[in-house]
Interface confidence: low
């Protein structure tokens, strides 16, 4: 019968010819009267065989990551008569991998989303390297991952790139950040490979700052000869806020001559200050009326970023007109 | 990556009308608020109108109000300028652009469109 | 509206000089909501600054903003060649306005 052991080659080899085993048969007593063949994908360019001894070698640089078995057949023939000495067989050459392979991120570029104040814990995104190294191989395609930038905001799971906010951040003191994260094959050890991916964590506005009057006084005029309904002129606050965040709603907080009311332009979120009823500047020659305003939109949980609304004193003096 | 590409400028009479075009690839449409500007040949850059993200309010430079409406197709990633009584003075090159995510700035721009209104 | 100044018209300088470029507002601009941006001919803008002093993304830092209010600028604090180009500042407190733009050429 045949007798082999399981025939392994490692990849990437750069010798000429390297030793793989030997292939022989049992009936076999070493007199040189055998002659052993080899047949199949690979015999003669990849592998060759000592006819007289069996033993095989590979004579060109292998790839596992290009083909990782190569099936072939053996023969062996007795020299003097030509018939063969045992039934064809068939066997496999496996190639062992070597770590000749680097983590690469697949999916670029990562760009994620993730509210502002979001709490420590909060996930952003998942980061994925793929390593083309046999994973069945000890760890040369066992990855770690890890921060390169991005400290103290976020942090890295290790073995599943999972990427975690670990600061509390404010959109409005930075809206994006850049983050490194670094793929190590070997778990990190020595002779380890890895590639980098850049993520673009963007922070998303939330409702944390109120709006707040640009003046803490304003002076307008109205005619006394002005019909109900006029507009005397605007009031304007700021939000740090963004998009429908920063959307507000003015309002008279104090008017004891109930004289004005206060509209609210939402394209332009400034406050209109409309006149309610006619004034008469012989009746009275100027008016003081406090305004407050308040965001649009403010979720339940946000309420404690909006405890009391910015406030401003407006005066409105009032010009005479000749009476006929 | 974001690429914006501008179309249907030509030479148009003066009265007349013309509809541009803006197709948008490379990141989510839908998610942002889109621009028209223009640039008269050899001048500044002059804002026309904008259009939130998801098409309810439009907003418009006062030399435009009236004759111009901006609308979009989420379904085709398209932005348009619908262009009317075109005057002398629309003669631009007009741009889209995209309002960036965290504010009101530009940072994306197409190529731009020429529109000449001449007799 | 707000009304953007920008000064000087033209700027004239060599590779490797600093640029400085003034833009004034008509009245103030609230949470220094104020971008720049750099057109080449034939070319469409693009930004370089936003929020007054943020950076885009991939512009190189010898771009720097500053200023709130009414008074902003922009500086190229060692010219290349490939900065000569026409410079826009654009606020965006209040709808949208552009100053006239200035033009920073090669000395």
């Known amino acids: 019968g045949w007798v082999w052991n399981q025939f392994f080659v490692p990849e990437e080899m750069n010798t000429t010819s390297h030793h793989i085993g030997q292939l022989r048969s049992d009936l076999d007593n070493g007199n040189n009267s055998f002659q052993y063949k080899l047949l199949g994908a690979g015999a003669g360019s990849t592998f060759i065989i000592d006819e007289r001894t069996g033993d095989i070698y590979a004579i060109q640089k292998l790839d596992r990551e290009e083909r990782s078995l190569y099936i072939l057949r053996a023969q062996v023939i007795d020299i003097a008569t030509g018939r063969a000495v045992e039934p064809e067989s068939e066997f496999v050459i496996k190639v062992s991998d070597i770590n000749d392979n680097e983590p690469k991120f697949l999916d670029e570029p990562y760009e994620a989303i993730v509210p502002e104040m979001s709490p420590e814990g909060t996930l952003v995104i998942q980061v994925t390297a793929s390593d083309a190294d046999d994973p069945s191989s000890g760890n040369n395609a066992r990855l770690l991952y890890s921060l390169l930038q991005g400290q103290p905001y976020f942090s890295v799971e290790p073995t599943t790139g999972v990427i975690r906010i670990s600061s509390k951040m404010d959109r409005e003191l930075q809206d994006e950040y850049w983050v490194i994260i670094q793929a190590k094959d070997m778990i990190g050890q020595p002779g380890a490979l890895s590639g980098t991916t850049s993520v673009l964590i963007k922070l998303s506005d939330v409702n944390d700052n109120k709006p707040i009057f640009k003046e803490s006084l304003y002076r307008l005029t109205v005619s006394e000869s002005a019909p109900t309904g006029t507009s005397i002129g605007t009031i304007m606050a700021y939000d740090n806020d963004i998009g429908e965040n920063a959307e507000m709603d003015y309002s008279i907080e104090e008017d004891d001559s109930q004289t004005f009311d206060i509209i609210t332009n939402h394209e332009t979120q400034e406050g209109i200050v409309i006149l309610k009823k006619k004034v008469d500047f012989e009746h009275q020659n100027h008016y003081g009326i406090r305004a407050k305003v308040k965001n649009h939109h403010v979720p339940e949980q946000l309420m404690k970023y909006h405890t009391e609304a910015s406030t401003t004193f407006i005066k409105i003096q009032v010009e005479d007109v000749d009476e006929p | 990556q974001v690429q914006l590409v501008e179309s249907g400028g030509g030479v148009v009479q003066p009265g007349g009308s013309l509809r541009l075009s803006c197709a948008a690839s490379g990141f989510t449409f839908s998610s942002y608020d889109m621009h028209w500007v223009r640039q008269a040949p050899g001048k500044g850059l002059e804002w026309v109108a904008v259009?939130?993200?998801?098409?309810?309010?439009?907003y418009y430079a006062e030399s435009v109000k009236g004759r111009f409406t901006i609308s979009r197709d989420t379904s085709k990633n398209t932005l348009y300028l619908q262009m009317n009584s075109l005057r002398a003075e629309d003669t631009a090159v007009y741009y889209c652009?995209?309002?960036?995510?965290?504010?009101?700035?530009?940072?994306?721009w197409g190529q731009g469109t020429l529109v000449s209104v001449s007799s | 509206e707000i009304v953007l100044t920008q000064s000087p018209g033209t700027l004239s300088l060599s590779p490797g000089e600093r640029a400085t470029l003034s833009c004034r507002a008509s009245?103030?601009?609230?949470?220094?909501?104020l971008a720049w941006y750099q057109q080449k001919p034939g070319q469409a803008p693009r930004l370089l600054i936003y929020g007054a002093s943020s950076r885009a993304t991939g512009i190189p830092d010898r771009f720097s903003g500053s200023g709130s209010g009414t008074d902003f600028t922009l500086t190229i604090s060692s010219l290349e060649p490939e900065d000569f180009a026409v410079y826009y500042c654009?606020?965006?407190?209040?709808?949208?306005?552009f100053g006239q733009g200035t033009k920073v050429e090669i000395k």
């Open positions: 009245q103030s601009v609230s949470n220094t909501y």
């Open positions: 259009i939130s993200y998801e098409g309810t309010n439009e």
């Open positions: 652009a995209r309002e960036r995510y965290f504010d009101w700035s530009f940072d994306y």
């Open positions: 654009q606020q965006y407190s209040n709808s949208w306005t």
